[in-house]
């Protein structure tokens, strides 16, 4: 891997759990300043594999609110606006990192957690098999 | 918002930056144990709006490797396997949290950062406008 030269101004790391436990500044830096705020706001409705967004809230998690996509149909919308069941609407999933309060209900102590979220849906052509 | 009763076993929070700076255990808990390992492995190729995955590596970030989707075509693949330019392949984007080493090159001090990643692509019907 890449060796990172250590900055002499780093905070002290004499914690017995180091490097498993680190200090994290929650003052979020947002790198998305130039992104279009509308970026995918209507794709969920206009896609050939449209989806609904469901709010998932958990006060023990940071961020506490995550939006989950659920495909509206099994099939995809064709040129006539009908569902074509020979195609599949499938969720595009991504593993993301969240912070889980640990011990529970603690305001300043967390553990990293990996969760799988459905971000949206895409239309795929299945390979058809005929079985005995 | 929801008030969380404080756990008396919480770590000390006398830090002058509290609650902006918190302790985070990097020993990741993975909640995805029951997910299908094949889940979206070939959707990128079989979608009507296929995409390529590009590796984005940054040793100052955690996770250091993030995969970015780039749609292969402007249009979508039709039933004949040709690109239909009356439809649009568009990226589905999601804001995710990552940890940025701060100060730089420090192994045990981070700041939360929000970045926008393209997870995959979907096919949308554009709204057509004819202008003078």
């Amino acid at each position: 891997g890449i060796t990172i030269p250590r900055n002499p101004g780093c905070p002290n790391s004499e914690d017995k759990n180091f490097p498993r436990t680190v200090m994290v500044n929650l003052n979020i830096h947002n790198r998305n300043t130039n992104t279009n705020p509308k970026r995918s706001s209507d794709y969920y409705n206009r896609s050939t594999s449209p989806w609904n967004l469901h709010r998932n809230e958990d006060p023990e998690r940071y961020p506490s609110v995550i939006w989950e996509a659920k495909c509206r149909h099994l099939g995809c919308i064709n040129a006539d606006g009908n569902v074509d069941y020979h195609m599949n609407s499938v969720p595009i999933q991504q593993e993301i990192l969240v912070l889980r309060r640990e011990p529970p209900h603690c305001p300043n102590s967390f553990r990293l957690e990996k969760i799988l979220v459905s971000v949206g849906c895409t239309c795929v052509t299945p390979i058809v098999h005929h079985v005995a | 918002g929801i008030t969380i009763p404080r756990n008396p076993g919480c770590p000390n929070s006398e830090d002058k930056n509290f609650p902006r700076t918190v302790m985070v255990n990097l020993n990741i808990h993975n909640r995805n144990t029951n997910t299908n390992p094949k889940r979206s492995s070939d959707y990128y190729n079989r979608s009507t709006s296929p995409w390529n995955l590009h590796r984005n590596e940054d040793p100052e970030r955690y996770p250091s490797v993030i995969w970015e989707a780039k749609c292969r075509h402007l249009g979508c693949i039709n039933a004949d396997g040709n690109v239909d330019y009356h439809m649009n392949s568009v990226p589905i984007q999601q804001e995710i949290l990552v940890l940025r080493r701060e100060p730089p090159h420090c192994p045990n001090s981070f700041r939360l950062e929000k970045i926008l990643v393209s997870v995959g692509c979907t096919c949308v019907t554009p709204i057509v406008h004819h202008v003078a």
């Epitope: 099994l74 599949n88 795929v124 299945p126 390979i127 005929h130 | 299908n36 094949k38 979206s40 070939d42």
Partner: nanobody, 116 residues
């Protein structure tokens, strides 16, 4: 490999009922959704009903909605299609299917004939 075996087809009078079963075995952990298609004589295959594995949502083709009901028994690895108020237009070979998103598996089919 996936195995699908349909049963329950047969001859029925218009207005009658039938219940189709599909026994599923093999590598089914990849399931996204499963259900039934049908192919009327001399026509293409059309969607009848489906059930999404992740949340149990059910979906129906326009021509059967309100008359047919899809259900499943996880313990028995069996999929069912309860067909009520049958019409001559429902005459077809009914195929059970299982779908991973990327791959779709169809069984051999069972014939349903509805006489007027």
């Amino acid at each position: 490999q996936v195995q699908l075996v349909e049963s329950g087809g047969g001859f029925v009078q218009a207005g009658g009922s039938l219940k189709l079963s599909c026994s599923v075995s093999g590598n089914t952990f990849i399931t996204n959704h499963m259900g039934w298609f049908r192919q009327p004589p001399g026509k293409g295959r059309e969607f009848v009903a489906g059930i999404r594995w992740s949340d149990g949502s059910t979906f129906y083709g326009d021509s059967v909605r309100g008359r047919f009901t899809i259900s499943g028994d996880n313990a028995k690895h069996t999929l069912y299609l309860q067909m009520n108020s049958l019409k001559p237009d429902d005459t077809a070979v009914y195929y059970c299917y299982i779908d991973s998103g990327s791959d779709r598996y169809y069984g051999q089919g069972t014939l349903v004939t509805v006489s007027s």
